[in-house]
């Protein structure tokens, strides 16, 4: 898993980057007209995103298969990875330049700078990721992604600085998901939640994901996790390898399947 | 920013029609529904239909069908409601709202409301 | 139609707690694509109302984030996390999924 000459080995694409999103209309793909899609942004506190900001979404993993409007009347998609079914094998902003026409019909990209946004990809050699909002307490019915890729070789060392979840016995309503990988299937490492910081991680490549989901109801203080790239030459042993598992944290399930 | 001025107050006779008008501003007329509510005291707020000024389609809740008539005069950003045939069940409080049909955000901006008295 | 249901009728709270607000519908709000469209509103006295949650659970420009709405299908919830003497007034549930597009009955919030 990685990612190597400029392409994800995996399909892992984010649904909103840098404040772009792609909407399209309730009746499906391809029902906006220019105005319509200018509304759709304005309704949600936004705008139409420009090339330049779609440009830069597409950079750190925005990946959409579908034509929308952009300012000033210009209408493309971003594509992350070249596939035969989308992008004519190219990457980039595929560009569909600026329509005369502004009725014609697609979908919509849209910037909003305050929208508050959880997760993405992270390439550099640290950083510290935050439950949305921090230091104040985390909302319902939250979901986001971080994915770490580093360069071959690196090896990702992760720590809890803080960490307060709702706790429950099985880690069912509010938590943190850690993966070995770039996905949130393969080499799954813990699941945790209440309020006890977790042992280091250490992961066996140069990938990683971290996954946070809160339910409808009970909210906590929330997390900062922060990870250090570990050079190839490294011999820290310090920390918590995700090849073995640990039975001294209530709130944490460990091992490797592909599920919970 | 985001207005909806609606009529004054409408005292109206039994069986006569009236006709209350929504003035928009600070935002692309043609580019929003407009919505019309009806809320009378103690019976919460009903939904009479919505007029989209960029085709002039309308929709209708069944209910007010043939009652109420939805227009709009686009050079002037305005939306109006011709209620016919008013009866007493009609003095209330009508709201003009801007809605967002096709995107399916509902209604978000609302008018003042205007007040209409059925009274002989 | 969707006949929504709105509980309780009234909600006296004291301020900084939390309230909760509960409507149901009669008939599922998700759509053939998915999505569901349930609004919440706010109406203070001699206003009138205003947008705070739509499509379930996002917050409209400029509503605090002491406001949240979840739920699915046909039951909804908003919360208010803690409550102030500015969000008095009824709150009201509003379905656009299905035409004829219908309110719930309301939820007074008062001070106990």
């Known amino acids: 898993w990685g990612f190597k000459d400029g392409i994800f080995h995996n399909s892992i694409w984010l649904e909103r980057a840098a404040g772009v999103y792609h909407r399209e209309a309730r009746s499906g793909k391809y029902k906006l007209t220019y105005a319509e899609a200018k509304a759709v942004c304005e309704f949600e506190g936004g705008h139409l995103a420009t090339y330049k900001q779609l440009e830069a979404a597409r950079k750190i993993g925005f990946h959409v298969c579908a034509a929308g409007w952009m300012a000033k009347g210009r209408v493309g998609y971003p594509i992350v990875k070249p596939g035969p079914n989308c992008g004519f094998g190219k990457t980039g902003i595929i560009d569909y330049g600026i329509r005369l026409n502004r009725s014609e019909r697609w979908d919509a990209y849209c910037y909003n700078p305050h929208a508050k946004e959880c997760g993405g990809v992270f390439t550099d050699p640290k950083q510290i990721f935050k439950s949305p909002g921090f230091p104040n307490e985390y909302e319902d019915n939250q979901i986001c992604y971080w994915h770490i890729r580093l360069k071959y070789g690196q090896r990702i060392h992760l720590s809890f600085l803080d960490f307060d979840l709702e706790d429950d016995p099985g880690c069912l309503a509010d938590y943190v998901e850690i993966y070995d990988s770039y996905d949130d299937v393969h080499g799954f490492v813990g699941r945790y939640c209440g309020d006890e910081l977790p042992d280091d991680i250490i992961s066996t490549g140069n990938v990683m994901t971290l996954k946070f989901l809160s339910d409808a109801s009970v909210t906590a203080g929330g997390f900062q996790i922060k990870y250090v790239a570990m050079d190839p030459v490294s011999k820290s042993s310090q920390g918590k390898n995700t090849s073995t598992t640990s039975t001294g944290n209530k709130n944490f399930l460990a091992g490797r399947f592909s599920h919970l | 920013q985001v207005q909806l001025q609606q009529s004054g107050p409408e005292l109206v006779k039994p069986g006569a029609s009236v006709k209350l008008s929504c003035k928009t501003s600070g935002y692309t007329f043609t580019s929003y529904d407009i919505n019309w509510v009806k809320q009378r005291p103690g019976q919460g707020l009903e939904w009479i239909g919505w007029?989209?000024?960029?085709?002039?389609?309308?929709k209708f809740n069944e209910k007010f069908k043939g009652m109420a008539t939805l227009t709009v005069d686009t050079s002037s950003s305005t939306a109006y409601m011709e209620l016919h045939s008013l009866t007493s069940e009609d003095s209330t409080v009508y709201f003009c709202?801007?809605?967002?049909?096709?995107?399916?955000?509902?209604?978000?901006?609302w008018g003042q409301g205007t007040s209409v008295t059925v009274s002989s | 139609d969707a006949v929504m249901t709105q509980t309780p009728l009234s909600l006296p709270v004291s301020l900084g707690d939390q309230a909760s607000i509960s409507c149901r519908s009669t008939q599922s709000l998700e759509d053939s694509n998915g999505n569901t469209y349930l609004n919440w509103y706010l109406q203070k006295p001699g206003q009138s109302p205003q947008l705070l949650i739509y499509r379930v659970s996002n917050r409209f420009s400029g509503v605090l984030d002491r406001f949240s709405g979840s739920g699915s299908g046909t039951d909804f919830t908003l919360k208010i996390s803690r409550v102030e003497a500015e969000d008095l007034g009824v709150y009201f549930c509003?379905?656009?999924?299905?035409?004829?597009?219908?309110f719930g009955g309301g939820t007074k919030l008062e001070i106990k």
């Open positions: 007029i989209y000024p960029s085709d002039g389609s309308t």
């Open positions: 709202a801007r809605g967002l049909w096709y995107y399916g955000g509902g209604v978000d901006y």
């Open positions: 509003l379905q656009v999924t299905h035409v004829p597009y219908t």
